[in-house]
Interface confidence: low
């Protein structure tokens, strides 16, 4: 019959002890296991692993020489008038000549001044910027309108409010060099013009700033 595995192991251990210490007294039972020893010294370095896969492509960097901090010199100009008080309804209000340093930059323009429109019936007026005589086409004109509809022409009176307003925008696609920036007053498509006034009794200004793309 088979001997249980546990008994087999015990018999073998006894045999080994007898063989090892033949002729001597038998060894007592094994003691309690000792504590873990101190960690051994580091082994020698392993061989290098195989190269990893390529990483994802990074975002396009900037040449240091072209970076904003490195080479962009602020370029701006302000033209101002203490009291334009210009009563024209069609035509140029004011202009400011600016030297644009780069062809791939944008121009930010601002006109700030009091605007007034009055009429007895519905009317509309448009204030807009031109660059060397043409409106901005990169991407669209820079404009502001005032539409006024009294609603009661029989009153035979007109409201006369002069309010400081601004016309502002960015224009791209203008070449480097001298740029004649002007603010005009004109008509709104399909509406009659009224009695316009620009820059009454207050400071008006055009601010032009060249911005990096």
């Amino acid at each position: 019959s088979e001997i249980p595995k546990g008994k087999q192991k015990a018999q073998l251990r006894q045999r080994e002890v007898v063989d090892l210490y033949n002729g001597m007294c038998l060894q007592g039972p094994a003691g309690v296991p000792g504590r873990d020893g101190s960690p051994g010294a580091n082994g020698i370095p392993g061989t290098p692993g195989i190269p990893g896969r390529d990483g994802f492509k990074g975002e396009k960097g900037e040449c240091l020489r072209e970076s904003f901090e490195e080479s962009w010199t602020p370029n701006y100009k302000q033209c101002s008038w203490s009291s334009l008080n210009y009563g024209i309804d069609l035509g140029k209000i004011a202009e400011c000549t600016f030297t644009k340093m780069r062809s791939n930059s944008a121009l930010r323009v601002l006109f700030s001044g009091s605007l007034r429109l009055k009429c007895r019936n519905a009317c509309c007026q448009r204030w807009y910027f031109t660059f060397n005589g043409a409106e901005c086409s990169g991407p669209l004109p820079i404009e502001a309108i005032i539409y006024l509809d009294q609603g009661s022409p029989e009153m035979n009176s007109t409201i006369n409010i002069h309010r400081t307003s601004s016309v502002e925008g960015l224009c791209e696609g203008i070449g480097a060099g001298l740029v004649d920036v002007a603010i005009w007053v004109g008509t709104c498509s399909d509406y009659p013009k009224g009695d316009a006034s620009t820059g009454w009794n207050s400071v008006s200004r055009i601010i032009i700033e060249e911005l990096p793309k």
Partner: antibody, heavy 119, light 107 residues
Framework: EVQLVESGGGLVQPGGSLRLSCAAS????????IHWVRQAPGKGLEWVGR????????NYADSVKGRFTISADTSKNTAYLQMNSLRAEDTAVYYC????????????WGQGTLVTVSS | DIQMTQSPSSLSASVGDRVTITCRAS??????VAWYQQKPGKAPKLLIY???FLYSGVPSRFSGSGSGTDFTLTISSLQPEDFATYYC?????????FGQGTKVEIK
């Protein structure tokens, strides 16, 4: 009434010079842009250049750049076109035109003055 | 520069006819197109601006349409005083450029 009247045209030899005037009335040129447009005999309209009398800034067509100069005298309410180094292909009726408040559109024109460049 | 191409270069029509002239820009000019009328020995006169708006004092038989690159001038019922040459012009950017003209003649 808005009016533009050109003068100064005539016959000139190739390489010669001529100065055209554009006298404005009914409006002040400093509140507008004044453009010059020419028309060769039997041909279409060709833009020559512009001046902003308010600040004196000018722009020119490539075909006349370096040879033609536009100026203005706001006290006389008059714009000028100085033409140097004239060529046969500059022969045309020269018009001055005003841009008022309508987006680079010529709302008033002069009657034109004929410039003939021939030997 | 933006090129403006007109067609036809000339046409013959009778009083009362409906006449259509087309103009094509070499690039998108939004609605920044004007039409002028010129009679022999005279300066051009503004008829239409911003593609479709009638300039003051111009008879309502003239009308304009279009945007982008294709534009049309229509005379709904041709009158004797309308026999002239018509030009389109882009006012989108400097330099302003004109079409080569369309001469409207009496049939």
């Amino acid at each position: 009434e808005v009016q533009l009247v050109e003068s100064g045209g005539g016959l000139v030899q190739p390489g010669g010079s001529l100065r055209l005037s554009c006298a404005a009335s009914g409006f002040t040129i400093s509140g507008s842009d004044i453009h010059w447009v020419r028309q060769a005999p039997g041909k279409g309209l060709e833009w020559v250049g512009r001046i902003s009398p308010y600040g004196g800034n000018t722009n020119y067509a490539d075909s006349v750049k370096g040879r033609f100069t536009i100026s203005a005298d706001t006290s006389k309410n008059t714009a000028y076109l100085q033409m140097n180094s004239l060529r046969a292909e500059d022969t045309a009726v020269y018009y001055c035109a005003r841009v008022g408040g309508l987006k680079l559109l010529f709302d008033y024109w002069g009657q034109g003055t004929l410039v003939t460049v021939s030997s | 520069d933006i090129q403006m191409t007109q067609s036809p270069s000339s046409l013959s029509a009778s009083v009362g006819d409906r006449v259509t002239i087309t103009c094509r820009a070499s690039q998108d000019v939004s609605t920044a197109v004007a039409w002028y009328q010129q009679k022999p020995g005279k300066a051009p006169k503004l008829l239409i601006y911003s593609a479709s708006f009638l300039y003051s004092g111009v008879p309502s038989r003239f009308s304009g349409s279009g945007s982008g690159t294709d534009f049309t001038l229509t005379i709904s019922s041709l009158q004797p005083e309308d026999f002239a040459t018509y030009y389109c012009q882009q006012s989108y950017t400097t330099p302003p450029t004109f079409g080569q003209g369309t001469k409207v003649e009496i049939k």
